[in-house]
Amino acid sequence: KFSKQSWGLENEALIVRCPRQGKSSYIVDWYYSQTNKSIPTQERNRVFASGQLLKFLPAEVADSGIYTCIVRSPTFNRTGYANVTIYKKQPDCNVPDYLMYSTVSGSEKNSKIYCPTIDLYNWTAPLEWFKNCQALQGSRYKAHKSFLVIDNVMTDDAGDYTCKFIHNENGANYSVTATRSFTVKDEQGFSRFPVIRAPAHNETKEVEIGENTNLTCSACFGKGAQFLAAVQWQLNGNKITDFSEPRIQQEEGQNQSFSDGLACVNTVLRIADVKEEDLLLRYDCLALNLHGLRRHTIRLSRKNPIDHQS
């Protein structure tokens, strides 16, 4: 219920806020969920708790897992869960879906791109901005506080924008990057029956027990701004929110605009620590708009170990 997905890259700083709210004066205790072991508050540790924040300075792939925070208010102990995944740095320029923050849309009049999660960090201006991994240069781009402003936005300004900044903790510096898609609103548009791009209907995905896996539900609904366009995952025909399994979390739907100008939305289902029982579930990708509902089903199967024959 009070669970939040957070992700980062190895060797970068990652700071996570407890999903349970409370006043800054409240004591917050953090634990490793699996072991119930308390996370230290001493800053000399690489991973330490600081009130409502959990800090990985820097993060390692092995830090991935579920963390429990307990906010001790005068009335209740409010429990929340932070589902943290640390990924290896990508060797190429491509930023995979699972590292993307929510998409923002811009137009000629409003072209602000905020750097995601930056408010959690102790950073100083200026931010560095990249588009599709290329450093942004030219007078059209203005890095202002925690956002980027693009003058005279054009359709080819759409793409993936990465902000890079330095987090300072007690004199030590740590790099942080965050990427989100930027789409340019097209005034001319239309709506049509949803087309699911992924997964294919009745697809089977091979997974390894104990590993993490992501399922992307991606659908397109027409061109331009859409009045109603939603994608979501269901488990055995039930909403994710009704399926009380903290290992399985659905990201908020993220808007995307492809080169063909189609308005698409995708949502990622993150499954942590895949278990045998997950293979028995039916995973439905649902796409809905005013024209109707389309459903594609995917199932998980165990990845067969490669036979080593002499």
């Epitope: 219920k1 709210q21 006043k23 004066s25 005068p74 009335t75």
Partner: antibody
């Protein structure tokens, strides 16, 4: 919009019990604590206790332990307060109140239930 | 229990006048909330976290204080401000309220 609809006025005999209800609408019931407050001309506003509808956890003012029992029904988004062994000093106006979970203050109040204990 | 003492119990003011009411806590609290109640109505959130105005509260209201001493000030009283104002602490269980300051207009 957020609404807390409390049950109607009650007239009960001393020694009896009564259950007051508070139906929530306009928000996700399980995301916010529900608190109960008593108001009388003599003692003013007194905090009775609270319930976390998601977990069923409760917290009480020591003064009202044994007097008030708080419950919540997630399916109907309704909070309940049972008052037992009623006496004349339990005659009061009772409020159910939602709490703003960012700042911990009472952001939405029910319209009140007046309880009169009299033989 | 933390006892909150509000003063004065009754405050009489003329429209346009500046008024201040205080709330003293028997031990230190981190912040104070204030509520406004008019006869026959439920209390309404007025000021939260010592100094933040709740939604719809006119800018002539302000709150301040720390530790054991807090206050609510109205820079220029208007007729609609006539009500009882309660302070409330959330720093320890049980949560407690002050007895209220009743603001009357002359």
């Amino acid at each position: 919009q957020v609404q807390l609809q409390q049950s109607g006025a009650e007239l009960v005999r001393p020694g009896a019990s009564v259950t007051l209800s508070c139906k929530a609408s306009g928000y996700t019931f399980t995301d916010y604590e529900m608190h109960w407050v008593k108001q009388t001309p003599v003692l003013g506003l007194e905090w009775i206790g609270a319930i976390d509808p998601e977990t069923g956890d409760t917290a009480y003012n020591q003064k009202f332990k044994g007097k008030a029992t708080l419950t919540a029904d997630k399916s109907s988004s309704t909070a309940y307060m049972e008052l037992s062994s009623l006496a004349s000093e339990d005659s009061a106006v009772y409020y159910c109140i939602r709490v703003d979970s960012n700042y911990d203050y009472f952001d939405y109040w029910g319209q009140d239930t007046t309880l009169t204990v009299s033989s | 229990d933390i006892v909150l003492t509000q003063s004065p119990p009754i405050l009489s003011a003329s429209p346009g006048e500046k008024v201040t009411m205080t709330c003293r806590a028997s031990s230190s609290v981190s912040y104070m909330h204030w509520y406004q109640q008019k006869p026959g109505s439920s209390p309404k959130p007025w000021i939260y976290d010592t100094s933040n105005l709740a939604s719809g509260v006119p800018a002539r209201f302000s709150g301040s204080g720390s530790g054991t001493s807090y206050s609510l000030t109205i820079s220029r009283v208007e007729a609609e401000d006539a009500a009882t104002y309660y302070c409330q602490q959330w720093s320890s269980n049980p949560l407690t309220f002050g007895a209220g300051t009743k603001l009357e207009l002359k």
